[in-house]
């Protein structure tokens, strides 16, 4: 027999099938050109010394074989003696080590058996009524197909499913969608209405995430504010990675869960942009402002559950001097300037009203003045910080005010508003005899003492009404009592107390007259 022809003789080996688990399988035969045909198969088991024979029986009952040696693929023409227009039955017999192994048979009409391609290119995946819908372009000249899918999860083996008949330029398949595990899908096609014809190869894997993206399960910490007025948000625990089926473990598109960090700066509400979303890998630096943070998980089906946090404001800035000068026209603040063309946000809020919204003002970009200071002024009419109470002031700075992560804290301090000089005057000044030449002076704390860092000191003034001599005694801001000594009996004195801030001398309290009685000896 010629090698290019099917040999109508008995094959050169005994005909018995050993029935072993190894051997030839998955035989498929199809037309590859107008007159050319191909059969191919898999061989399971050790291949050394194996000879393959493709067997063919015609409808007349006559049978022939092609000897292919160790090859598991054979091409032949319509002149090889095999009828291509009528139904034939084909199988493979593999001879090795004095035994024969036989593949399952396929019965088909070779001329009509076109090798179908699996879905190629982009397979679109979407969710439809709790199921998975896959859609793809029908390969050229292959309209009319039966389609099957197989799918597996990280913990299960392949399960086969049917997509049903397809008869259009686009084909689609409805498949089961898992709630909480990723899946790998593959698709294959064959010619519609030719049960004996062979299936195409399986398509490339289609990797599908679970319907619900996993909970982020992230842990954060925030560092303390640095000298530059910024603090780093750090990720202590990464989100748990999704377990993937075998074919999806490379850089498989479609299955990934993306995590995004959403920042909302609560302080300084008058700035241009309050919210920013960035990838979780990009851990930002933050100012000392208060923030709300969310980590949002999403996959190809949309957003999943999120995780939320609040980052309280960090008010522990380096001691930066804030000078406040109050004039007839209004009030001006001065502080050490940042770089050229910096925008500042000045925010203030009455102490004890932290729950309410703070008032804030955004300056135009400004350069440092000749003394290296930045300024902000307001008129008395504006009513800003006009009430006689303690205000918490925070100043933020940014050269790029529209970029939320580029703000920094310049300073955080307290200021007593309104007429602090008068409002801070100590009341209830009282004098008590202490000894023969000294008295104890007490007073109620100044309102300024409710404002951290505002009250610099008390000054107690004592005037001798006879000689008009005046002495002044500085007192720590935490004290509300002082002892005046070296006083003379029988002399009238007046005592007054004032409360001073770093930038403002307070108003004296009402004069309080006293004298030490002359002691008459017996």
């Amino acid at each position: 027999c010629r090698t290019s022809e099917c040999c109508f003789q008995d094959p050169p080996y005994s005909d018995a099938d050993s029935g072993s688990a190894s051997g030839p399988r998955d035989l498929s035969c199809y037309r590859i050109s107008s007159a050319g045909y191909e059969c191919s198969w898999q061989y399971e088991g050790p291949t050394a010394g194996v000879s393959h024979f493709l067997r063919c029986c015609l409808s007349s009952g006559r049978c022939c074989y092609f000897a292919t040696g160790s090859a598991t693929r054979l091409q032949f023409s319509d002149q090889a003696g095999v009828s291509v227009l009528h139904t034939v039955t084909l199988w493979v017999e593999s001879w090795a080590r004095n035994r024969t192994e036989k593949s399952p048979e396929v019965t088909l009409q070779l001329y009509k058996s076109v090798k179908y391609k699996p879905p190629l290119g982009d397979i679109k995946v979407s969710k439809l009524a709790g199921q998975l819908r896959m859609e793809w372009e029908t390969p050229d000249n292959q309209v009319g197909a039966e389609v099957q899918f197989r799918h597996r999860t990280p913990s299960s083996s392949w399960k086969l499913g049917d997509c049903g008949p397809q008869d259009d330029d686009t084909e689609s398949c409805l498949c089961p969608l898992e709630m909480n595990v990723a899946q790998e899908f593959q698709l294959r096609r064959r010619r519609l209405g030719s049960q004996g014809s062979s299936w195409s190869k399986w398509s490339s894997p289609v990797c599908v995430p679970p319907e619900n993206p996993p909970q982020p399960q992230v842990r954060f910490s925030v560092e303390q504010l640095g000298r530059d007025g910024r603090r780093r948000l750090t990720l202590k625990e990464q989100p748990t990675q999704l377990e993937l089926p075998e074919g999806c473990q490379g850089p498989a598109p479609g299955v990934e869960v993306t995590y995004q960090l959403q920042l909302h700066m609560l302080s300084c509400p008058c700035k241009a942009k309050a919210t920013r979303t960035l990838p979780l890998e990009k851990m930002p630096y933050l100012s000392g402002a208060a923030y709300n943070v969310a980590v949002i998980s999403s996959n190809r089906f949309g957003p999943g559950p999120n995780q939320t946090w609040h980052i309280p404001a960090d008010t522990h800035t380096e001691p930066v001097a804030l000078n406040i000068s109050v004039g007839t026209n209004g009030t001006t603040m001065y502080w050490p300037a940042r770089a050229q063309s910096t925008t500042y946000c000045i925010e203030w809020q009455p102490v004890g009203q932290e729950g309410s919204l703070a008032t804030c003002n955004l300056t135009a970009p400004q350069d440092p003045d000749p003394a290296g200071m930045a300024t902000y002024s307001w008129s008395r009419e504006s009513g800003a910080m006009g009430q006689e109470k303690c205000y918490h002031i925070t100043i933020f700075a940014s050269a790029h005010p529209k970029k939320l992560t580029l703000w920094s804290t310049v300073l955080s301090t307290y200021h007593f508003g309104g007429n602090a000089s008068a409002a801070g005057t100590p009341h209830h000044v009282s004098v008590k005899n202490h000894s023969l030449d000294s008295v104890s002076v007490d007073w109620a704390p100044s309102l300024l003492s409710t404002c951290p860092g505002v009250l610099k000191e008390y000054v107690v003034r004592c005037r001798d009404e006879d000689s008009n001599q005046v002495s002044e005694h500085p007192v720590q801001p935490t004290e509300t009592q002082v002892t005046l000594s070296d006083l003379r009996a029988g002399v009238a004195y007046t005592v007054q107390v004032r409360a001073d801030t770093a930038w403002l001398r307070g108003a004296w309290s009402q004069p309080q007259r006293f004298s030490i009685k002359v002691q008459v000896s017996d």
Epitope: F220, W309, I311
Partner: nanobody
Framework: QVQLVESGGGLVQAGGSLRLSCAAS????????MGWFRQVSGKEREFVAG???????YFADSVKGRFTISRDNAKNMVYLQMNSLKPEDTAVYYC??????????????????WGKGTLVTVSS
């Protein structure tokens, strides 16, 4: 392993007050951010209040101005003072903890340790 035990729940009239306590053991308490969450049956657990190791606090909008949270690091205790209680404050209140610096989780999945809860019932 941190253990948390809540106490102080009970029945109270609308407008009344209640103070919940949470005793913590088994960890460096001052390093933990502590929080109170509440849950009505059939609904998700919701954030009520949180406090950092240095006593920065944060409250849900629904309780702002009515509830205060405080901690005593020496005694390993966290407190939730609830004033002007309303019927809609009725829930099981849970104490929760996470080892974190300066960040208060406001969703339950941000917390690592939980107490068993104490029931607060506000009658109208």
């Amino acid at each position: 392993q941190v253990q948390l035990v809540e106490s102080g729940g009970g029945l109270v009239q609308a407008g009344g007050s209640l103070r919940l306590s949470c005793a913590a053991s088994g960890g460096p308490f001052s390093g933990y951010v502590m929080g109170w969450f509440r849950q009505v049956s059939g609904k998700e657990r919701e954030f009520v209040a949180g406090i950092t190791g240095i006593s920065s606090t944060y409250f849900a909008d629904s309780v702002k101005g009515r509830f205060t949270i405080s901690r005593d690091n020496a005694k390993n205790m966290v407190y939730l003072q609830m004033n002007s209680l309303k019927p809609e404050d009725t829930a099981v209140y849970y104490c929760a903890a996470v080892n974190s610096f300066g960040v208060i989780p406001t969703s339950p999945n941000g917390m690592d340790y939980w107490g068993k809860g104490t029931l607060v019932t506000v009658s109208s």
